[in-house]
Interface confidence: low
């Protein structure tokens, strides 16, 4: 599995590097942190444990998607 | 087609060093884990370790103190030292493709290393 | 370690008839992300082993689709629908889920 890999980015296009997700059962992972009146950070990769999720703080916004097709 | 080329000496003495070495032809040499596995004479499989591009390795606890396993990335190469042997590490060595987590779906053709005084 | 146990040890098979090996981890095998981590070899006699599934139940390429592998958690089976002469072998069952990484003991097939 092929997935785009970064960490704490502000932009997509920052987001471009290509990680082989070479363990079974792995998906690409995407993280969305946005602080309140900052941009929003943007980590992806693989991941073992990838599991969907979203959850407002008073501060921000914390949101988590998962899949598993190359590049997605 | 990936192939793994293994090779190294075939005999030893007791308290030697095992020295072998793999070399990786075709896909991706950095995109995965690389072991090395070993099996006794008419006996099963044993899993010595693992190592990645980078380096990173993993060993069975059970030869942890005496197992080297190194990279040469330039050389798609992997290497394996087993310090002070002894007849019980008598075996067929197999370099393989694959690690925790992982199947090994490439293997090497396999070394006898016999220990004898 | 997670200690993994086959049955039988020696399997004699008529060609055309099915057969089956038993392979048991002394821990769970599945993972919270819903795979097993179980893969099953054949070692030919004079050769390496080759890959014949992993993930429990997935075949490897080029494996004939008369070999099938079932099971989760603790309890797993290999299936040869129908036994041909190239099956003969050792056949090992192992787990990439914990290090160090094992092997069940092996299981010989051989033809009557």
């Known amino acids: 599995l092929l997935c785009y890999s970064c960490k704490a980015q502000v932009s997509n296009e920052d987001c471009l590097q290509v990680e082989n997700c070479t363990q079974l059962g792995e998906q690409c992972w995407t993280a969305r942190i946005r602080a309140v009146g900052l941009l929003t950070v943007i980590s992806k990769g693989c991941s073992l444990n990838c599991v969907d999720d979203s959850q407002d703080y008073y501060v921000g916004k914390k949101n988590i998607t998962c899949c598993d097709t190359d590049l997605c | 087609q990936v192939q793994l080329q293994q090779w190294g000496a075939g005999l030893l003495k007791p308290s030697e060093t095992l020295s072998l070495t793999c070399a990786v032809y075709?896909?991706?040499?950095?995109?995965?884990?690389w072991s090395w596995i070993r099996q006794p004479p008419g006996k099963g499989l044993e899993w010595i370790g693992e190592?990645?591009?980078?380096?990173?390795?993993n060993y069975n606890p059970s030869l942890k103190s005496r197992v080297t396993i190194s990279v040469d990335t330039s050389k798609n190469q992997f290497s394996l030292k087993l310090s002070s042997v002894t007849a019980a590490d008598t075996a067929v060595y197999y370099c393989?493709?694959?690690?925790?987590?992982?199947?090994?779906?490439?293997w090497g053709q396999g070394t006898l290393v016999t220990v004898s005084s | 370690d997670i200690v993994m146990t086959q049955s039988p040890l020696s399997l004699p098979v008529t060609p055309g008839e099915p057969a089956s090996i038993s392979c048991r981890s002394s821990q769970s095998l599945l993972h919270s992300n819903g795979y097993n981590y179980l893969v099953w070899y054949l070692q030919k006699p004079g050769q390496s082993p080759q890959l014949l599934i992993y993930l429990g139940s997935i075949r490897a390429s080029g494996v004939p689709d008369r070999f099938s592998g079932s099971g989760s958690g603790t309890d797993f089976t290999l299936k040869i629908s129908r036994v041909e002469a190239e099956d003969v072998g050792v056949y090992y069952c192992m787990q990439p889920l914990q290090t160090p990484i094992t092997f069940g003991q092996g299981t010989r097939l051989e033809i009557k």
């Open positions: 393989a493709r694959g690690g925790s987590y992982n199947y090994f779906d490439y």
């Open positions: 075709g896909g991706s040499f950095s995109g995965n884990y």
């Open positions: 190592i990645n591009h980078s380096g990173s390795t």
